[in-house]
């Protein structure tokens, strides 16, 4: 799986999970989140050669097409596969609220 | 939706469905499919600016991050959303066979 256990331990030019820390204020301009100040969002990037973590029949076909027609612009792309929520603390007036924001953290990637 | 109805009628640099005809013999080296000789596989390509057909909370966060940090390499990618099967005719000896290959045609795209 193109997850942290694999991608963070291997130098990999192909599609893989990449570390990305996002600071809510600095990087997103969000001042309303009290805790955490930021989080490990991660992201997916890298090449999608033939059969590298191909997600569907179409992505396999597209990577085979790309192998035979390397000048073509049509190729699969490295995107998130498994995502996890992030629990945040914010205030409405003086009342603290805890909320879970869904699909905030990328845990693994795929070629789609 | 970033489908043919929208994308094929608009000049769109952003993520959209793009036409791609694949000839089985020429483009994939597949000689076993009798009919069709090829098909409109289509593919997804284009930029994913902030909120352009974002698929998840993470892709929204990433596109916002990319807006504020344009030099960063982290950005969402344009990939297939809805896929459809393709019905093919091939032969086993002299016996014709009809089969449905799943997820062969891209119908719409998203930023993920």
């Amino acid at each position: 799986a193109l997850d942290a256990a694999y991608c963070f331990r291997n130098v990999q030019d192909n599609c893989c999970l990449r570390p990305l820390y996002i600071d809510f204020k600095r990087d997103l301009g969000w001042k309303w989140i009290h805790e955490p100040k930021g989080y490990n969002a991660n992201f997916c990037a890298g090449a999608c050669p033939y059969l590298w973590s191909s997600d569907t029949q179409h992505s396999r076909v597209l990577s085979l097409y790309n192998t035979i027609n390397p000048e073509a612009s049509a190729s699969p792309c490295c995107v998130s596969q498994d995502l996890e929520p992030l629990t945040i603390l914010y205030y409405i007036g003086k009342t603290p609220k805890i909320e879970q924001l869904s699909n905030m953290i990328v845990k693994s990637c795929k070629c789609s | 939706a970033l489908d043919a109805a929208y994308c094929f009628r608009n000049v769109q640099d952003n993520c959209c469905l793009r036409p791609l005809y694949i000839d089985f013999k020429r483009d994939l080296g597949w000689k076993w499919i009798h009919e069709p000789k090829g098909y409109n596989a289509n593919f997804c390509a284009g930029a994913c600016p902030y909120l352009w057909s974002s698929d998840t909370q993470h892709s929204r966060v990433l596109s916002l991050y990319n807006t504020i940090n344009p030099e960063a390499s982290a950005s969402p990618c344009c990939v297939s959303q809805d896929l459809e099967p393709l019905t093919i005719l091939y032969y086993i000896g002299k016996t014709p066979k009809i089969e449905q290959l799943s997820n062969m045609i891209v119908k719409s795209c998203k930023c993920s």
Partner: antibody, heavy 118, light 108 residues
Framework: QVQLVQSGAEVKKPGESLKISCKGS????????VAWVRQMPGKGLEWMGW????????RYSPSFQGQVTISADKSISTAYLQWSSLKASDTAMYYC???????????WGQGTLVTVSS | SYELTQPLSVSVALGQTARITCSGD??????AHWYQQKPGQAPVLVIY???DRPSGIPERFSGSNSGNTATLTISRAQAGDEADYYC??????????FGGGTKLTVLG
Amino acid sequence: QVQLVQSGAEVKKPGESLKISCKGSGYSFTRYYVAWVRQMPGKGLEWMGWIDPGTSNTRYSPSFQGQVTISADKSISTAYLQWSSLKASDTAMYYCARMLAWGWFDYWGQGTLVTVSS
Amino acid sequence: SYELTQPLSVSVALGQTARITCSGDNLGGYYAHWYQQKPGQAPVLVIYDKSDRPSGIPERFSGSNSGNTATLTISRAQAGDEADYYCASYDSSLMMVFGGGTKLTVLG
């Protein structure tokens, strides 16, 4: 039903040539690759190479490149593995297997035992 | 070329769960497939692609992978599951490789 039927056992002397066969039936022969796998006595499986019968493209394991030749005749749905000069170390069971271009062997032949001894 | 590493043997009590691992540098991105071979017989595909089972293979057989390790899990192990198990994978030019094989023994 899908079948891969291999030629019978062979006993040869070192230096002799040999060509064994694998006939596919019950499926479109050019749709799938045919791979060859060696299993020496009491040992594991070793991938030797594959052929795409539709295009005659081949790929060999570095360990077997130049040692064997893989070919196919799609008109009779048959793949071949051949040696020009056998060695005692070629003594093994040889399997052919059907392989989709996505990388797995879904049907196997029954195996051909090749014994090379002086 | 690359290598896939498997334990030489794994033992499991009858009815319990057996796990056979396969590790290799390529397994992050290229899927592992699993084959069962009983003495005197040709290998049989038991898991392919991400974790798919061919028809006829019981649901007790499942596959997963994390990091560069693929795992074949056999739940509710039966005496008939005793066999050698091989993982296999490939690269983008479809150069294939097999693991060294794991002998599964079902005790009891």
